[in-house]
């Protein structure tokens, strides 16, 4: 089943997806599409990278992380209710049927009328930070050391189960990655 992410109307949504390039500058093509991952490629492509660049994107869809270090997490700017649905992150590893496919479910909630409390109780804001080492500048992607042989889907599921913000903070500085090569 898809991992679920939430954002409010008017906010930016964040859908995490990572891999570890085999060598610096030796990238794997990645596509993001609206709709569940099909057998090949991505349906309704919104963004694509090739062996070295972002070579296709559509309005409001962008990579805010360092994609050349494997952070291919998708940011959707200024979301509306129509952005709800399944998104596919496909890491196009060379070879037959080698692709890593991740279906991520985005749920858009109507904007709150009342101001948000100062303490962030909604896990949505904490979870994205768990999966990236990016701050305001570039940083190396790290592999999660305390949980061996864990993949992105497992981390995503785990994160959704760990609603406690203290645990979220404990994991925040680790990056869940897929190793290529």
């Amino acid at each position: 089943s898809e991992v679920e992410y939430r954002a409010e109307v008017g906010q930016n949504a964040y859908l995490p997806c990572f891999y570890t390039p085999a060598a610096p500058g030796n990238l794997v093509p990645v596509c993001w599409g609206k709709g569940a991952c099909p057998v090949f490629e991505c349906g309704n492509v919104v963004l694509r990278t090739d062996e070295r660049d972002v070579n296709y994107w559509t309005s409001r869809y962008w990579l805010n992380g360092d994609f050349r270090k494997g952070d291919v997490s998708l940011t959707i700017e200024n979301v509306t209710l129509a952005d709800s649905g399944i998104y596919c992150c496909r890491i196009q590893i060379p070879g037959i049927m080698n692709d890593e496919k991740f279906n991520l479910k985005l749920v858009i909630k109507p904007a709150k009328v009342t101001p948000a409390p100062t303490r962030q109780r909604d896990f949505t804001a904490a979870f994205p930070r768990m999966l990236t080492t990016r701050g305001h500048g570039p940083a190396e992607t790290q592999t999660l050391g305390s949980l061996p042989d864990i993949n992105l889907t497992q981390i995503s599921t785990l994160a959704n189960e760990l609603r406690d913000s203290r645990l979220a903070n404990d994991l925040r500085d680790s990056g869940a990655t897929i190793r290529i090569g």
């Epitope: 610096p24 990238l27 090739d50 070295r52 660049d53 805010n64 570039p138």
Partner: antibody
Framework: EVQLVQSGAEVKKPGASVKVSCKAS????????IHWVRQAPGQGLEWMGW????????NYAQNFQGRVTMTRDTSIRSAYMELSNLTSDDTAVYYC????????????WGQGTLVTVSS | AIQLTQSPSSLSAPVGDRVTIACRAS??????LNWYQQKSGKAPKLLIY???SLQSGVPSRFSGSGYGTDFTLTIGNLQPEDSATYYC?????????FGQGTKVDIK
């Protein structure tokens, strides 16, 4: 010493094609990408596309899609840029530049080739 | 395409001055921003790559800063040989794009 040496100036008629060469020396040719950038007289720089000198893979700017072809010959460590269906707007200095993918930037440039399109 | 807007388009300063050139990207490009110097009739020369890294052989009076959308090239102690046009360039998304250039003159 790293060097990129380009072919000489060309004068072409509108509708014709031009092929500019870029010969590399002083480094492992297949470890780098070759980009092509042009500069019209008195204007800024315009990126045209890249070729992976190892695999031959290419990526062209949309402005040039269908009109530009980038190739390379690893045996003589040379890259080529062919531009077809020339118009007077294609009058420019054409540069090749090398780029290592790990730090994508153009660290060495050819001396430039002036292509003049005139009837 | 990602637009890069440089400011100012030209400037004039005396030898020894500290000058800064700004480059703003229309979308976030991380640190994939490079700076080039071009003298009249010559090919561009790489000064700074990935926003802050000084290219080998380039004098240390040149420095770069910024991340995301806002970047700056600083020439710390302007010299007569720094008279040139300076371009920023992004290597995040295809097509790669350049700023329109900043012409630096020595007073």
């Amino acid at each position: 010493e790293v060097q990129l040496v380009q072919s000489g100036a060309e004068v072409k008629k509108p509708g014709a094609s031009v092929k500019v060469s870029c010969k590399a020396s002083g480094y492992t040719f297949t470890d780098y990408y070759i980009h092509w950038v042009r500069q019209a007289p008195g204007q800024g720089l315009e990126w045209m596309g890249w070729i992976n000198a190892n695999s031959g893979a290419t990526n062209y700017a949309q402005n040039f899609q269908g009109r530009v072809t980038m190739t390379r010959d690893t045996s003589i460590r040379s890259a080529y840029m062919e531009l077809s269906n020339l118009t007077s707007d294609d009058t420019a200095v054409y540069y090749c530049a090398r780029d290592r993918a790990t730090t994508p930037s153009f660290d060495y440039w050819g001396q430039g080739t002036l292509v003049t399109v005139s009837s | 395409a990602i637009q890069l807007t440089q400011s100012p388009s030209s400037l004039s300063a005396p030898v020894g001055d500290r000058v800064t050139i700004a480059c703003r990207a229309s979308q976030t490009i991380g640190h994939y921003l490079n700076w080039y110097q071009q003298k009249s009739g010559k090919a561009p020369k790489l000064l700074i790559y990935t926003a802050t890294s000084l290219q080998s052989g380039v004098p240390s009076r040149f420095s770069g800063s910024g991340y995301g959308t806002d970047f700056t090239l600083t020439i710390g102690n302007l010299q007569p040989e720094d008279s040139a046009t300076y371009y920023c360039q992004q290597s995040f998304g295809i097509p790669y794009t350049f700023g329109q250039g900043t012409k630096v003159d020595i007073k």
